[in-house]
């Protein structure tokens, strides 16, 4: 199973739940389908709220029990490292995959946290980051910002990545902007 | 008790198909994934293929996929194991175990000319 | 392809206690609570001796007993006794390829 990591602000956007949560117990597999449960205690919601409703508090997060179908293993012992993840919702329940955002949240850039605070929400509606995978590559539309990580280097460790997010400039345009300059 | 008893094993000649069986007791067969493991004359055991409770999901191991389907019938509970284009390197006793626990007793498979 | 390490034999007196170990890797023992331990004996199947790391199955003596510290897991049978004498395999839910087991290990008791 192989998958090349998105955008943080992609894997935010595409994600119904968005959290940062510790991992603190060993993977148990369900007998019946073979989905595997990590034991989690969520420290803080970066998204979801509405998609949860009342039902806040998410104390485990599945996937599946093999690397072949893309299951998510989880490799620190660290039961006090904080991580973010990105998932999806099924049935109430939080589901993630190899491909999912999942990171030790000291491995975030101050940009990157800020992100998933409280930026990357605002680009979700209109804006999309468009992967340059070889070149030439053009923008399809003036919502969309090229992401040329890949071109350059690993795409997660991209300046890109790891200090911007595609905003809203104006109705109909979006453009890279730094986290920097946001508002604290 | 559990009790998984195998069956439809036999001679076989290399290319040639058989088709084993499990049948399940003394649980809910729905709620189990099940799999096969097999072990060749003399040697250690080896699993070969595993299927979830519902049958939505199967997993091969490298050595048989391809010629190898599981699947299984909840409503018989049984299980089971079609094997096509069978090799010498088959022969082996198999058996159907539940999840990760219990084993069946067995059905030898010998491929030869 | 034995994924899980067991020596390949031991042996002890009637009476005396041995233990067994099964050494394999984070993605396996080390990464999951499904560590299971068969007896064989010739000619005959695989029988349950312990299942999930330490439980024991109805019927088994509480002779033997299983546990595990990091990779390494292992079975100690105690008291041992004549029909002990038999194939031990470990097994493990494998992460990469869903059941992974050890090559065995001849259990020879003395006298």
């Known amino acids: 199973c192989t998958c090349v990591p998105p955008h943080p602000q992609t894997a935010f956007c595409n994600s119904d739940l968005v959290i940062r949560a510790k991992f603190v117990g060993t993977p148990e597999v369900n007998q019946t389908t073979l989905y595997q449960r990590y034991e989690i205690k969520m420290t803080k919601m970066y998204k979801g709220f509405q998609a949860l409703g009342d039902a806040a508090d998410i104390r485990f997060v599945y996937t599946p029990a093999m690397e072949s179908v893309c299951g998510y293993f989880h490799r620190s012992h660290n039961r006090s490292e904080e991580f973010l993840i990105a998932g999806k919702l099924q049935d109430g329940l939080l589901h993630i995959t190899t491909c999912s955002f999942v990171a030790p949240w000291n491995s975030l850039s101050l940009a990157q946290r800020r992100g998933f605070t409280k930026t990357y929400t605002v680009g979700c509606e209109e804006c999309t980051v468009f992967p340059c995978l070889s070149i030439p590559c053009k923008l399809q539309s003036g919502t969309h910002c090229l992401w040329t990580d890949q071109l350059l280097q690993g795409s997660e460790k991209g300046f890109q990545s790891r200090h911007l997010a595609c905003l809203p400039r104006e109705p109909g345009l979006c453009t890279w902007q730094s986290l920097r300059s946001q508002i604290a | 008790q559990v009790q998984l008893v195998e069956s439809g094993g036999g001679l076989v000649q290399p290319g040639g198909s058989l088709r084993l069986s499990c049948a399940a007791s003394g649980f809910t067969f729905s709620s189990y994934a099940m799999s096969w493991v097999r072990q060749a004359p003399g040697k250690g055991l080896e699993w070969v293929s595993a299927i979830s409770g519902s049958g939505g999901s199967t997993y091969y191991a490298d050595s048989v996929k391809g010629r190898f389907t599981i699947s299984r019938d909840n409503s018989k509970n049984t299980l089971y194991l079609q094997m096509n284009s069978l090799r010498a390197e088959d022969t082996a006793v198999y058996y159907c175990?539940?999840?990760?626990?219990?084993w069946g007793q067995g059905t030898l498979v010998t491929v030869s000319s | 392809d034995i994924a899980l390490t067991q020596p390949a034999s031991v042996s002890g007196s009637p009476g005396q206690s041995i233990t067994i170990s099964c050494t394999g890797t984070s993605s396996d023992v080390g990464g999951y609570n499904y560590v299971s331990w068969y007896q064989q004996h010739p000619g005959k199947a695989p029988k349950l001796m312990i299942y999930?790391?330490?439980n024991r199955p109805s019927g088994v003596s509480n002779r033997f007993s299983g546990s595990k510290s990091g990779n390494t897991a292992s079975l100690t049978i105690s008291g041992l006794q004549a029909e002990d004498e038999a194939d031990y395999y470990c097994q493990s839910y494998d992460f990469k390829t869903y059941l992974v087991f050890g090559g065995g290990t001849k259990l020879t008791v003395l006298g």
């Open positions: 175990a539940r999840f990760f626990d219990y």
């Open positions: 999930d790391v330490s």
